[in-house]
């Protein structure tokens, strides 16, 4: 039950993390225009992995893509690379995962290879997590360094009363989106490595317990499970009792869908 | 195509409240904002402020602050200024004008004379 | 505030003439993200409100002749008239549509001879 339910919940924790990372790398607002301490502009900038946009008081937005890669910084293109794999990793975790869940019955999967994928999965959801936090630190280290410098030479306009004020940029909802939701990938990530113990064969000595039926003894021996360091292929999980008890394994669940816009 | 039109002169004491309006008419009234400017005679143009008449956003020029108010309706499509504590420097033709790409007024009321006279 | 300076603050021409106008900004009026100046022309004809000629420094607003330019860049801009007509004798106002508050210059009265 409880190992069902950490699997479950690290499923869906990852499945929003990975929404998350999805939507904080579409986003526009990765850095916005630094409003304090600075003249009030009728015009709002912001800026993205993809896009850089205005928005103006009366209302217009306009954005432009980025359509060169050579000139674009390599901070960025990094950046966008790192989101990229998360994403990818991320996905194809949510693949496995779906199939390695406890409530979901495939032909005669074992309980052994549910455990290899659900550790698969895992894996990939803290790496998808880490490329995500990796990716928005990075942003964020170079808005920072970008940000003292602009500082640094705010009024570059030289000689009279005419003055350029530089544009700063600050911290945008993506980066926090982006942090929250890789936290959320790497959290699901652990999650599926600690169901991934408890779904894998552990090899346990009970007793035999004996059973005398009239006329005759018949001898039930508990299943065992082989220890979670290797998944060997000599464990044949048979169910031996069952007790007439319906088990969690029994339990049909539909996974929910979850539309992202 | 668009109008909007202003209400008609007013002639006020000093101290006095005033409420201009401009009814906005061939766009969608929730969509541009609003601008008010001020013109005394044989001067040139200040701006007062601005509303966004979707969501009542308004945006003001420090020097009107206490004076102006600005509201819209949107059931009327109609946008109005109140002006308060008026005295003679107050005496100017108000314009609305709605926003436009650049932070340009494109559409003009045709003004509304106001004159602050003891 | 940003202070909007026009020159000259009137000239008379004679139609067919091509008629320069200036207008200074205390600040850059270009703005990074796009790379636009946030610098308006406007038209104003005695006992008429004002008419919008030109937005981001350089776009015509469409219906405006296309004898009316404007150019020039972060504080320097200037409204051409390659042809002036009659009808274009009016009063031209500058805007700064790029800080709060949003401001105008005091005018170039244009006259015909």
């Known amino acids: 039950m409880a190992v069902t339910a950490c699997q479950g919940l690290g499923f869906v924790v990852s499945l929003i993390g990975i929404a998350g990372i999805i939507a904080a790398t579409c986003m526009d607002q990765w850095s916005t225009q630094d409003l304090y301490n600075n003249p009030v502009t009728a015009v709002f900038n912001y800026q993205g992995l993809w896009r850089s946009c205005v928005r103006e008081s009366s209302g217009f937005t306009e954005c432009r893509g980025y359509f060169t890669l050579l000139g674009l910084p390599a901070m960025l293109q990094a950046v966008r690379a790192l989101m990229i794999v998360g994403i990818v990793l991320g996905a194809i975790g949510l693949l496995v995962s779906i199939f390695a869940l406890k409530c979901i019955r495939i032909g005669s999967m074992e309980d052994s290879a549910k455990a290899n994928m659900t550790l698969t999965s895992g894996i990939m959801f803290i790496v998808s997590g880490l490329c995500a936090i990796a990716g928005v630190s990075v942003f964020a280290n170079m808005l920072v360094t970008n940000f003292w410098m602009s500082t640094a030479n705010m009024y570059t306009g030289m000689g009279g009363m005419v003055q350029t004020v530089q544009t700063r940029y600050t911290f945008g909802a993506a980066l926090f989106v982006g942090w929250v939701a890789g936290g959320l990938t790497l959290i699901g990530g652990v999650m599926m490595c600690i169901a991934c113990r408890g779904l894998a064969p552990e090899e346990t000595n009970y007793k035999a317990v004996s059973y005398h039926a009239s006329g005759h003894s018949v001898a039930y021996k508990p299943g065992g499970f082989k220890a979670s360091t290797g998944f060997g292929s000599n464990t044949k999980n048979k169910k031996i009792y069952d007790g007439g008890a319906r088990t969690e394994d029994e339990v049909q669940s539909y996974p929910s869908k979850h539309d992202y816009v | 195509q668009v109008q909007l039109k202003q209400s008609g002169a007013e002639l006020v004491k000093p101290g006095a409240s005033l409420k201009l309006s401009c009814k906005a008419s061939?766009?969608?009234?929730?969509?541009?904002?609003i601008n008010w400017v001020r013109q005394r005679p044989e001067q040139g143009l200040e701006w007062i402020g601005w509303i966004f008449p979707g969501d009542a956003t308004t945006m003001y020029n420090e020097k009107f602050k206490g004076t102006a108010t600005l509201t819209a309706d949107k059931s009327s499509s109609t946008a109005y200024m109140q002006l308060s504590g008026l005295t003679s420097e107050d005496s100017a033709v108000y314009f609305c004008?709605?926003?436009?790409?650049?932070?340009?007024?494109?559409?003009w009321g045709q003004g509304t004379l106001v004159t602050v006279s003891a | 505030d940003i202070v909007m300076t026009q020159s000259p603050s009137s000239l008379t021409v004679t139609a067919g003439e091509k008629v320069t106008m200036s207008c200074k900004s205390s600040?850059?009026?270009?703005?990074?993200?796009?790379?636009?100046?946030?610098l308006t022309w406007y038209q104003q004809k005695p006992g008429q409100p004002p008419k919008l000629l030109i937005y981001?420094?350089?776009t015509r607003e469409s219906g405006v002749p296309d004898r009316f330019t404007g150019s020039g860049s972060g504080t320097d801009f200037t409204l051409t008239i390659s042809s002036v007509q009659a009808e274009d004798l009016a009063v031209y106002y500058c805007?700064?549509?790029?800080?709060?508050?949003?401001?105008f210059g005091a005018g170039t009265k244009l006259e015909i001879k």
């Open positions: 600040q850059s009026l270009l703005n990074s993200g796009n790379q636009k100046n946030y």
């Open positions: 061939g766009y969608t009234f929730t969509t541009y904002g």
């Open positions: 805007q700064n549509a790029y800080y709060y508050p949003l401001t």
């Open positions: 004008a709605r926003f436009y790409y650049g932070n340009s007024f494109v559409d």
């Open positions: 981001w420094a350089s």
